[in-house]
């Protein structure tokens, strides 16, 4: 059994300074661990690249809204 207590924590230390088109984004996950220096969003692009972004920025919030809405639409 993996030791969850010692599981590695992913943190973001720098944020992208470029707005990413929502068409390029596939998913996101939030970094909320108190072990990380910054609250962050990690976007995964359609080519599986992970990008750290600042959740305080409006484009980041709008992108999360867009991706959330996609989860309620059945994939065909």
């Amino acid at each position: 059994q993996p030791d969850a207590i010692n599981a590695p924590v992913t943190c973001c230390y720098n944020f992208t300074n470029r707005k990413i088109s929502v068409q390029r984004l596939a998913s996101y996950r939030r970094i909320t661990s108190s072990k990380c220096p910054k609250e962050a969003v990690i976007f995964k692009t359609i080519v599986a690249k992970e990008i750290c972004a600042d959740p305080k920025q409006k484009w980041v919030q709008d992108s999360m809204d867009h991706l959330d809405k996609q989860t309620q639409t059945p994939k065909t």
Epitope: R29, R30, P55, K56, Q61, M64, D65, D68, K69
Partner: nanobody
């Protein structure tokens, strides 16, 4: 971490109205999808309503659609649930939740929860 505190619950007669509030403190409120859930005695917790970060999209369970309205004020770090035409079946503890992870109405995608406020609708 986000702290959520609900208020506005109480006892009301069928057909009456209540407005629930949920005040958030801690991390950036506008970066969370916000939802209301409820749990009646001996029943499972159920989704009631959600609002996107921008406030531009709302979504409701079929049981409350047309009667309840969710809104948010990002400047005040508060989300509201206006409940009209209340029915005895609406009796439950109402919980406010902040959704950090990608998703929609699934409780598992909401990371932070308030302690709940009791709403009792008498016939």
């Amino acid at each position: 971490e986000v702290q959520l505190v609900e208020s506005g619950g109480g006892l009301v007669q069928a057909g009456g109205s209540l407005r629930l509030s949920c005040a958030a403190s801690g991390r950036t409120f506008s970066s969370y999808r916000m939802g209301w859930f409820r749990q009646a005695p001996e029943k499972e917790r159920e989704f009631v309503a959600l609002i996107t970060r921008s406030g531009g999209t709302t979504f409701y369970s079929n049981s409350v659609k047309g009667r309840f309205t969710i809104s948010r004020d990002n400047a005040k770090n508060t989300v509201y649930l206006q409940m009209n035409s209340l029915e005895p079946e609406d009796t439950a503890v109402y919980y406010c939740a902040a959704g950090a992870q990608m998703g929609w109405a699934e409780a598992s995608t909401y990371d932070y929860w308030g302690q709940g406020t009791q709403v009792t609708v008498s016939s």
